[in-house]
Amino acid sequence: VGGYICEENSVPYQVSLNSGYHFCGGSLISEQWVVSAGHCYKSRIQVRLGEHNIEVLEGNEQFINAAKIIRHPKYNSRTLDNDILLIKLSSPAVINSRVSAISLPTAPPAAGTESLISGWGNTLSSGADYPDELQCLDAPVLSQAECEASYPGKITNNMFCVGFLEGGKDSCQGDAGGPVVSNGELQGIVSWGYGCAQKNRPGVYTKVYNYVDWIKDTIAANSHHHHHH
């Protein structure tokens, strides 16, 4: 909501999760792994990489089925705490200028830092209008105090807020699982909010920094290395 059409394939780590229709976004973090939101879980997912217009075959797409879909063991469907999942692709993505991985964070998100949020979600705060072309939004990371004041009792240490307290610019339905990137690092995953782009109701995002060890451990545990003696 309140964003702009991204320059074509300018967000090469952005993926669309498809189950007969686009339902969530995600981020490519290595040639065979995608991170998304826990509440985007489905047992069968096709990951679509290299997308810009999700309704048109433009020639840069890679459609790869999920081989493994791993939701965080402490995901809470009511509070959306630990709203993160990992998808192992059935075959590695071909990395190129239009499809490439985003780095995991080396430090937690800092208030005031500019970030890029992207997705194919609803662009209206009242009503619905789902775009075909990838939308981008530049937005600042808010302080934890501002975040907690916006959602009293709802914000855990695994969440942070990004956006504008005045409203008008935000992620929305269909953006879940997608990236929040600051300084070339995946700081957030689109998670939840009360409505979209409402005053004093900024978007809430999963704090990826808290899950770097889980991500690395899960990838290691689900990668088959053949040792030749």
Partner: antibody, heavy 126, light 106 residues
Framework: QVQLQESGPGLVKPSETLSLTCTVS????????WHWIRQPAGKGLEWIGR???????FYNPSLKSRVTMSVDTSKNQFSLKLSSVTAADTAVYYC????????????????????WGQGTTVTVSS | DIQMTQSPSSLSASVGDRVTITCQAS??????LNWYQQKPGKAPKLLIY???NLETGVPSRFSGSGSGTDFTFTISSLQPEDIATYYC????????FGGGTKVEIK
């Protein structure tokens, strides 16, 4: 409180197009998604599709080639057209509203249907 | 398409009995499973959403449980007004209904 009322011809000839309208009263059509469901006599329920006032639609893949849904916000109505009907399309047709706004997660998903019309019987016969 | 298999297709129980209906999905649908009650000549009525959440105004004798592929709907103490057909419905990917379970009084 929101109420739904289906209307349309009770009899349609084979190969023709079935057309139904659902009128929403007691509330605005603008916020939720709106569905069509049908039920052949003595049988189970089959979801046909859903529409939003923006025109955003999802159709049952098995019926997709024959279904068109539209919405008229000025009249607080939404409509169903089902083309090339056969006797197998004879059923009670229901319109319904879903609980779109009960969750705050930002995925695209489907929702349970909490308000239904009373249904209208459509018979396909020559 | 996700197929929903409900059992039994019909049952007969006495007033006060505990009634259990099961629903099985052809693939994992997490908790995206709802239960409806339909009385003869009437539209379905939502009872339970997201597997276990009771819809507002629905009596507490109705409950639901399960996750993944296997779900259960329970009436803790059957009442005469509970005579109806009950349907499970998944909304994980598009929407499909189970075949229904007709509940009668002995």
């Amino acid at each position: 409180q929101v109420q739904l009322q289906e209307s349309g011809p009770g009899l349609v000839k084979p190969s023709e197009t079935l057309s139904l309208t659902c009128t929403v009263s007691g509330g605005s059509i603008s916020s939720n998604y709106w569905h069509w469901i049908r039920q052949p006599a003595g049988k189970g329920l089959e979801w046909i599709g859903r529409i939003h006032t923006s025109g955003s639609t999802f159709y049952n893949p098995s019926l997709k080639s024959r279904v068109t849904m539209s919405v008229d916000t000025s009249k607080n109505q939404f409509s169903l057209k089902l083309s090339s009907v056969t006797a197998a399309d004879t059923a009670v047709y229901y319109c319904a509203r879903d609980i779109t706004n009960y969750g705050s997660g930002k995925s695209i998903r489907f929702y349970p249907m909490d308000v239904w019309g009373q249904g209208t019987t459509v018979t396909v016969s020559s | 398409d996700i197929q929903m298999t409900q059992s039994p297709s019909s049952l007969s129980a006495s007033v006060g009995d505990r009634v259990t209906i099961t629903c099985q999905a052809s693939q994992d649908i997490s908790n995206y499973l709802n239960w409806y009650q339909q009385k003869p000549g009437k539209a379905p009525k939502l009872l339970i959403y997201d597997a276990s959440n009771l819809e507002t105004g629905v009596p507490s004798r109705f409950s639901g449980s399960g996750s993944g592929t296997d779900f259960t709907f329970t009436i803790s103490s059957l009442q005469p007004e509970d005579i109806a057909t009950y349907y499970c419905q998944q909304d994980d990917t598009f929407i499909t209904f189970g075949g229904g379970t007709k509940v009668e009084i002995k």
